[in-house]
Amino acid sequence: YPNASPLLGSSWGGLIHLYTATARNSYHLQIHKNGHVDGAPHQTIYSALMIRSEDAGFVVITGVMSRRYLCMDFRGNIFGSHYFDPENCRFQHQTLENGYDVYHSPQYHFLVSLGRAKRAFLPGMNPPPYSQFLSRRNEIPLIHFNTPIPRRHTRSAEDDSERDPLNVLKPRARMTPAPASCSQELPSAEDNSPMASDPLGVVRGGRVNTHAGGTGPEGCRPFAKFI
């Protein structure tokens, strides 16, 4: 199930959206211009993210439109900040057995969550659905981002970063796929799949096994169809 990873190559255009999914709804994590973080039922310009992989499973998450880093305070509140503080704005990424991703602060141990409660991450735990994320490639036309065209300079090492300040166009390493026991239950995110062609739909990423008459591997959360 490698294509569900938020850390994908340039085939996803660099921009992704993190969303929680229950059997009948989904919320996309968005970082507003004022730094407020919440969820929206659909992709928005503020839910378009760049996720940069660092060593040892750490990631840095940036809101492309707000140009703010996703950060966490000591109480577990998440917010967007223009200032990058390594202690508050780096998260440990882990893929659960069910193929969903969780992000937690190595400093404060709280999970990134769209729910209001603050819960610490414990290895082996089953977090609530609003603390488990999937990723979806950006479906919003880039013109909606209305990013000003940077000034042209003589081509240099600095030129690349100025034209792409958030590194959204640079390929990134793939993460380890989820266990095979789950991957057969989950759809890929190819361009012709429902996940790629449902920018505004209600996700039906249920936690119950949709295969008639049986239950899947422990911890797996197979998808039902989109509505």
Partner: antibody, heavy 117, light 106 residues
Framework: QVQLVQSGAEVKKPGASVKVSCKAS????????MHWVRQAPGQGLEWMGI????????SNAQKFQGRVTMTRDTSTSTVYMELSSLRSEDTAVYYC??????????WGQGTMVTVSS | AIQLTQSPSSLSASVGDRVTITCRAS??????LVWYQQKPGKAPKLLIY???SLESGVPSRFSGSGSGTDFTLTISSLQPEDFATYYC????????FGPGTKVDIK
Amino acid sequence: QVQLVQSGAEVKKPGASVKVSCKASGYTFTNHYMHWVRQAPGQGLEWMGIINPISGSTSNAQKFQGRVTMTRDTSTSTVYMELSSLRSEDTAVYYCARDYVDAFDFWGQGTMVTVSS
Amino acid sequence: AIQLTQSPSSLSASVGDRVTITCRASQGISSALVWYQQKPGKAPKLLIYDASSLESGVPSRFSGSGSGTDFTLTISSLQPEDFATYYCQQMYDDFNFGPGTKVDIK
């Protein structure tokens, strides 16, 4: 402040349809799913369905498949629930409720629908 | 679908009593459980979300606990305005409610 204001009580005959409205205010309408929940007299709460406010996509409890239609009008921040082929067992109070990721945090005042011949 | 059962279905108590209501899920739902209070003729009111988090404005005598399949709502010292029906709801894979527990005056 967040408010969900529902339409008034209705009396319908068996076989007819009823359409209940729920007007939202005090928040960004398109940022929260809306649910419909009903409660028959003296009974518990029964979840009916959910609507995505931006796309209009819906998902209903299996019990109501084919009989319930949920729609929304983003220009007026209003959601609608239409229940068709009414029977006496559909006599209930119908509530709309806002989804806040981890709970239904705001509810409408309820609309009493009476089905009687 | 995940089923929720509540016990007791009704109870009689006096002002000042400690009241405990349990909700059991047919399979694990992590902490994705909500408690509501409903009074006759009124819409349900959110009390507890994420199993144990108190909704803003709700008195601290209400508390929730549990995770996985077993959950508890506790009213530490019952007040006259607490006589009502209490419902649990799961937000894990669907949105179904428990059958309710009616708390009335002894």
